[in-house]
Interface confidence: low
């Protein structure tokens, strides 16, 4: 999906209002210094591409972040403020139903959410000029 036509301001507002709190809740008890941020992004659409990938694409050691509250809110936000996003995600949603239920919050999932927090911060920081 091409994120260049999203309403970045509205996404920022949704992130600050709800998604950020859910991400921080998920990370509760973990210090941000516990993980090195290895994923970065060079512009706002690129940040959203990386955020989508980390949030919704299962990895071998963290299969089901997409079921978490922050992921559901992220999906709703992207669907709301990125034209045509919902349509591109129909197949992804069907595939998601087949994924196994998360048993425990593994260290790899915590690391992935730490990366997500970093990407969101980068996304927000590129919007500072709008304030």
């Amino acid at each position: 999906y091409d994120f260049t036509n999203c309403d970045f301001q509205k996404i920022e507002a949704d992130y600050l209002r709800t998604i950020s709190k859910d991400l921080i809740t998920y990370m509760s008890g973990t210090k941000s210094t516990d993980f090195n941020n290895t994923v970065s992004c060079s512009n706002r659409p690129h940040c959203l591409t990386e955020i989508q990938s980390l949030t919704f694409n299962p990895t071998p050691r963290c299969a089901s972040l997409a079921k978490e509250m922050f992921a559901r809110k992220t999906k709703a936000t992207l669907a709301l403020w990125c034209p045509g996003y919902s349509e591109t995600q129909i197949n992804a949603t069907q595939a998601m139903k087949k994924r196994r239920k998360r048993k425990v919050t593994t260290n790899k999932c915590l690391e992935q959410v730490s990366q997500l927090l970093g990407l969101w911060r980068r996304f927000i920081r590129t919007l500072l000029k709008k304030q």
Epitope: D2, T4, S40, P45, R125, K129
Partner: antibody, heavy 117, light 107 residues
Framework: QVQLVQSGAEVKKPGASVKVSCKAS????????MHWVKQAPGQGLEWIGV????????TYNQKFKGKATLTVDTSTSTAYMELSSLRSEDTAVYYC??????????WGQGTLVTVSS | DIQMTQSPSSLSASVGDRVTITCRAS??????LAWYQQKPGKSPKLLVY???TLAAGVPSRFSGSGSGTDFTLTISSLQPEDFATYYC?????????FGQGTKVEIK
């Protein structure tokens, strides 16, 4: 208003180094990436590299690794590019330019670096 | 690296003409394309970004279109101040690269 003001023209001998400055004003320096672009006489534009003033993270065009070094001084909102081991093919106008999304909305006036023995 | 190829490399046109410059990327860059205008001895000036978004203060006679690999900059009615060199640049990912430029000259 946004301004990027670069240092003046330089004439250097082959093998020497040169440090070009770019003073930013009219915006929050740490909120934008700062890029450097080369334009050789009569030629097109070539991206050298980028520095994020927020955390000094740098990314270079492979071609300019070892040639260009990018730094910033956030206390003075100034970006620097040092070119080392100068050769005649480094003769060019060098621009600093800022970006949020990889396109360049404001540019410095350019600094001509001439390498001549 | 992504290669950007502009055509034509130069063109002659008259005031009032409709001018079209094309830019082709060596791979899919979605809408991550910018256009710049440069006059002799001056810095480049941003005209268009995200393929079709006009930069602030740019006259509406300029327009951008395209996505994927093929892009176009159109000047609907060429004005005397539009004679310059135009560059495309992808802003998909590093390294950012420019086209070789298209010089628009007076016929």
């Amino acid at each position: 208003q946004v301004q990027l003001v670069q240092s003046g023209a330089e004439v250097k001998k082959p093998g020497a180094s040169v440090k070009v400055s770019c003073k930013a004003s009219g915006y929050t320096f740490t909120s934008y990436w700062m890029h450097w672009v080369k334009q050789a006489p009569g030629q097109g534009l070539e991206w050298i590299g980028v520095i994020d003033p927020y955390d000094t993270d740098t990314t270079y065009n492979q071609k300019f690794k070892g040639k260009a070094t990018l730094t910033v001084d956030t206390s003075t909102s100034t970006a620097y590019m040092e070119l080392s081991s100068l050769r005649s093919e480094d003769t060019a106008v060098y621009y600093c330019t800022r970006s949020l999304d990889g396109f360049f909305d404001y540019w410095g006036q350019g600094t001509l670096v001439t390498v001549s023995s | 690296d992504i290669q950007m190829t502009q055509s034509p490399s130069s063109l002659s046109a008259s005031v009032g003409d409709r001018v079209t410059i094309t830019c082709r990327a060596s791979e899919n860059i979605y809408s991550y394309l910018a256009w710049y205008q440069q006059k002799p001895g001056k810095s480049p000036k941003l005209l268009v970004y995200f393929a079709k978004t006009l930069a602030a203060g740019v006259p509406s006679r300029f327009s951008g279109s395209g996505s994927g690999t093929d892009f176009t900059l159109t000047i609907s009615s060429l004005q005397p101040e539009d004679f310059a060199t135009y560059y495309c640049q992808h802003h998909y990912d590093t390294p950012w690269t420019f086209g070789q430029g298209t010089k628009v000259e007076i016929k």
